[in-house]
């Protein structure tokens, strides 16, 4: 149990890094967690005994010993960053703060029917960090129902004051609720010539892009590679913005790369987790510790296990020296990035993996795929589950996908005739059905949530959630798959696979080993031609070979259509229906998951 509880009427003395304003101590803790150096914080709540100018201050702190002296102070609330915790962390904050005006640059003012509409507007505006909405009861008539969209350099308010009849809140981009497009391409030999808001050192354009994604003001970036002609600018990552939200000028320049912030699809990409090693590369920074280590992997583990370590450089041992052990230099800096990057000195560098838990678990790299063949291997599809019914006898009922530590996404039609969740069992980490014995551990189902517009598979809305009775501990053989981003609606997926234990032909039996088949997506227009008697809606997605031969079939229902994009697997479809199995010119029809992301989040994030 890491120290998550807040210490009331307690102030940590000293160790100040910076002061920001947050509407609550809980959010102060989140800001501290995402700050590269913050380990502790002190928040000042509103109180008659406190100077109003200090209300809502969140002082971010660091300490070499990872703790600071505690002093009693009324209205002070202190605590620790979640960096010390092993659980998943999220920056998503759906709270609405009543009678608080969060100050920032008011760059857009418009009428909105409700605070929710104002928040949605903020979420779908590229610049917006937070908003303040004047309610119908606001004293000034001309300001009633006004929605002010705001941004600041830090992404947090510049000040927070009490103001009756207004409400404030944050953009929900980090909750995967934005409709903004995600431009995932990195453009080689391109410089974006807009204004720089910050610059950091990065080993490659991918790390630069991730830094841009979690920097509150960065909308796009330019990275100068190590071959860039001007030596002083090599490995420089320029974080940029513009009024329009897009680069105004693109200049063709060799050895530079540019790209965009992926803030609106950050739930399905690694942002904090820089897991690569950089060979013949030295990261410079403040030294924390020097330890003998047998490999760069061991050095990365040392860095990950020292809470203040942000990055490292490993110098391999010279032959016959120090028992073959090299030196591991653990380092940190004010912004979490190296202060300088040098090449050609023989070092191997990398970053802590401690921040990987600040990314969605679904972005973790999994085992390389086994190409060819139809039988899967263990750990190949760690999100795939087998859903069993125990009535009248135990058998495989449907497939499903782990999308959260208590949630399985599957098809609604699987539950025809299922009277109660009590008869259901979810088995994860299973390759062969024969592994399932009486004593095999399973997850009980607490609740079946079927889409309320579902009638039958062919008419759509064939989607259901299972809430598990206990949480799934993620391992290599059981972990979640990412939901597609709403901003990725136009992505063309080319690496899609359907998996399941279903029939291999129409008259068959459930397979013992999990089967896999690579299947191309088919446009909805093409699919509609093949199913003239049905309405193929935008909430469905089709996949199959024109000549047939590979398809999902009976028993695969509810299972995933998984597509790999930018090294991350996305749950693009849920196996739903089709005419026969693998028939010529009869593609399989799947529930189009991206169209249900809001529904999924509404059901799974309900308090």
């Amino acid at each position: 149990e890491c120290v998550t509880q807040l210490l009331k009427d307690t102030c940590f003395e000293g160790g100040d890094i910076t002061t920001v304003f947050t509407p609550s101590a809980k959010y102060c803790q989140v800001v501290c967690t995402y700050h590269p150096r913050c380990l502790l914080f002190t928040f000042t709540a509103e109180s008659p005994s406190e100077d109003p100018t200090r209300w809502f201050t969140c002082v971010l702190k660091d300490s070499v010993t990872e703790t600071l002296p505690r002093v009693n102070r009324t209205a002070a609330i202190s605590g620790y960053s979640f960096k010390q915790c092993s659980h998943q962390i999220s920056a998503c904050n759906k709270d609405i703060y009543v009678d608080l005006d969060m100050k920032g640059i008011n760059y857009n003012s418009s009428v909105a029917k409700s605070a929710q509409e104002c928040q949605e507007r903020c979420t779908d505006d590229v610049h917006c960090h937070f908003f303040t909405y004047a309610t119908r009861q606001f004293p000034s008539l001309e300001h009633r129902n006004i929605c002010l969209l705001k941004h600041t350099q830090t992404g947090t308010p510049t000040r927070i004051t009490k103001l009756d009849k207004v409400v404030s809140g944050f953009s929900l981009k980090s909750c995967a609720l934005s409709n903004l497009a995600c431009i995932r391409d990195i453009f080689p030999n391109t410089v974006f010539a807009d204004s720089n808001i910050d610059s950091v050192m990065a080993p490659d354009a991918f790390v630069c892009g991730r830094i841009c994604t979690h920097h509150p003001g960065c909308l796009f970036f330019t990275f100068f590679s190590q071959e860039w002609p001007k030596e002083s600018q090599r490995n420089l990552c320029l974080l940029k913005t513009s009024e329009s939200g897009l680069p105004s000028t693109r200049i063709k320049k060799s050895k530079a790369l540019s790209g965009f912030s992926l803030q609106s699809c950050r739930h399905s990409i690694p942002v904090f987790c820089h897991s690569s090693f950089y060979h013949d590369t030295d990261f410079l920074g403040e030294e924390l510790d020097i330890v003998a280590a047998k490999s760069h992997e061991a050095c990365q583990k040392l860095c990950t296990n020292a809470v203040r370590c942000q990055f490292f450089t490993y110098t391999p041992a010279q032959a016959s020296c120090n028992e073959g052990k090299g030196k591991c230099y653990l380092k940190l800096s004010s912004n979490g990035s190296p202060t300088k990057i040098l090449h050609g000195r023989g070092g191997i560098s990398g970053y802590t993996l401690r921040l990987c838990k600040m990314d969605n678990e679904c972005t973790t790299k999994i085992k390389p795929r086994i190409v060819g063949g139809t039988a899967s291997v263990r750990g190949e599809w760690p999100w795939q589950v087998t859903l069993h019914t125990t009535s009248p006898t135990q058998r495989h009922l449907c497939g499903g996908s782990i999308i959260g530590n208590q949630w399985i996404l599957t098809a609604a039609h699987c539950f025809y005739g299922v009277e109660s969740p009590k008869i259901l069992r979810v088995y994860s980490g299973i390759l062969n059905q024969s592994e399932i014995k009486e004593d095999t551990s399973f997850f009980g189902v607490q609740e079946i949530i079927i889409h309320d517009q579902y009638k039958m598979a062919e008419s759509g809305y064939d989607i259901a959630l299972l809430k598990l009775e206990t949480t799934v501990n993620y391992t290599d053989s059981q972990r979640p798959i990412c939901l597609p981003s709403k901003g990725d609606r136009n992505v063309i997926y080319t690496d899609c696979w359907v998996t399941g234990w279903g029939y291999r032909k129409l008259r068959d039996k459930i397979q013992n080993t999990l089967q896999k088949a690579k299947i191309p997506l088919v446009t909805n227009e093409e699919c509609q031609k093949r199913y003239r008697g049905h309405k193929i809606t935008h909430k469905m997605i089709c996949a199959g070979y024109r000549e047939g031969g590979k398809d999902a079939c009976k028993g695969d229902s509810g299972g995933p259509l998984s597509c790999k994009h930018n090294e991350v697997w996305h749950l693009v479809g849920i196996t739903s229906w089709g005419e026969g199995c693998a028939q010529r010119e009869r593609p399989g029809v799947y529930t189009n998951v991206v169209e249900y992301v809001d529904w999924i989040l509404e059901k799974t994030q309900a308090v």
Partner: nanobody, 119 residues
Framework: QVQLQESGGGLVQPGGSLRLSCAAS????????MSWVRQAPGKGLDGVSG????????YYADSVKGRFAISRDDAKNTLYLQMNSLKIEDTAVYYC????????????RGQGTQVTVSS
């Protein structure tokens, strides 16, 4: 070089107590998260308990919650595990290791100390 040396194991009856110690050297002990892990006969390594470099954040496996207590003394470069209400199923070789779940580095562990709970 990371060096860890466990001690304090032994034979104890069910319901009894033991205190394990782990002396650390070769690295700045106070900076690092630490763990106790165990290996029962014929089984794999299992995380038992972990403690943050701050000394305040701790982790316990469900099977030992309320019975075991982890602590550290940074001045002495030593990690401790107080084991109370011991059960037969606690019989294992106990190792101290660098890191804490989910980042425990099982490669950086000591030689281990045998704990046997038997009536």
């Amino acid at each position: 070089q990371v060096q860890l040396q466990e001690s304090g194991g032994g034979l104890v009856q069910p319901g009894g107590s033991l205190r394990l110690s782990c002396a650390a050297s070769g690295f700045t002990f106070s900076l690092y998260d630490m763990s106790w892990v165990r290996q029962a006969p014929g089984k794999g390594l299992d995380g038992v308990s972990g403690i943050g470099g701050d000394g305040g954040s701790t982790y316990y496996a469900d099977s030992v919650k309320g019975r075991f207590a982890i602590s550290r003394d940074d001045a002495k470069n030593t990690l401790y595990l107080q084991m109370n209400s011991l059960k037969i199923e606690d019989t294992a070789v106990y190792y101290c290791a660098l890191g804490r779940p989910p980042y425990t580095d099982y490669d950086s562990r000591g030689q281990g100390t045998q704990v046997t709970v038997s009536s």
